[in-house]
């Protein structure tokens, strides 16, 4: 039986050529997080595994960060960041939780890390 | 720019099924990813699911999860979403939509009210 929640970061927006930390958090479960994975637009960014730490994926180890906690920093963002970035917890006994975090990379100032925008 | 109609709605009791369908005016081959989302009376819009048209990689709500299925039909131009046992809370408008595109004018949706 499945009894936790995901909160994540939700909607957010950031500036081209910063940086953004996507977080989730799981709660009201005293399920083991044996993994993380954090997965962005069909493909594997980063691995946090509780036994042998974080592994990031080749191609994104220039621009991506382990941290804070389980979470991630991606760094020297561009447009094409955009999208849907998916935190996957994995868990025993429970099971996989899913979050989803949608990011929006905009070219001027007008970025607020955390604003609020029409999903998606 | 692909059109997008939601279709598949109706009424049905607790525990039984529908199958949504998004039909696009163009190929979705050129839509990297497609998603479901619904709107609950009162409530903000949320995300329910993906599916990657070409990896074909699919992500679901933890609401949903095991219950609903997504996919892709590349050659009808068309998304699915398989919805079984159905409970009282999925009642909602249902939208398709381009899930990695950040802001859209929405189309009508589709009603899915369930019934205890």
């Known amino acids: 039986m499945m009894t936790g929640t995901i909160e994540t970061t939700g909607n957010i927006s950031a500036e081209k050529g910063g940086s953004i930390i996507l977080q989730c958090h799981l709660s009201s479960t005293t399920a083991q997080v044996t993994q993380v994975n954090w997965e962005q637009q069909d493909q594997l960014l980063a691995i946090c595994n509780a036994d042998l730490g974080w592994h990031i994926s080749p191609s994104f180890k220039d621009r991506v960060a382990p941290g804070p906690g389980l979470g991630l920093t991606l760094q020297s963002l561009t447009v094409n960041d955009t999208g849907e970035y998916f935190c996957i917890y994995h868990t025993y006994p429970d099971g996989t939780y899913t979050g989803r975090i949608f990011l929006e990379v905009l070219e001027s100032s007008v970025a607020e890390h955390g604003a609020r925008f029409q999903i998606p | 720019e692909v059109q997008l109609v939601e279709s598949g709605g109706g009424l049905v009791q607790a525990g039984g099924s529908l199958r949504l369908s998004c039909a696009a005016s163009?190929?979705?081959?050129?839509?990297?990813?497609m998603g479901w989302f619904r709107q609950a009376p009162g409530k903000e819009r949320e995300w329910v699911s993906s599916?990657?048209?070409?990896?074909?990689?699919?992500y679901y709500a933890d609401s949903v999860k095991g219950r609903f299925t997504i996919s892709a039909d590349n050659a009808k131009n068309t998304v699915y979403l398989q919805m079984n046992s159905l409970k009282p809370e999925d009642t909602a408008v249902y939208y398709c939509?381009?899930?990695?595109?950040?802001?859209?004018?929405w189309g009508q949706g589709t009603q899915v009210t369930v019934s205890s």
């Open positions: 163009g190929s979705i081959t050129s839509i990297r990813s």
């Open positions: 939509a381009n899930s990695n595109k950040p802001k859209f004018d």
């Open positions: 599916v990657y048209i070409f990896g074909g990689s699919t």
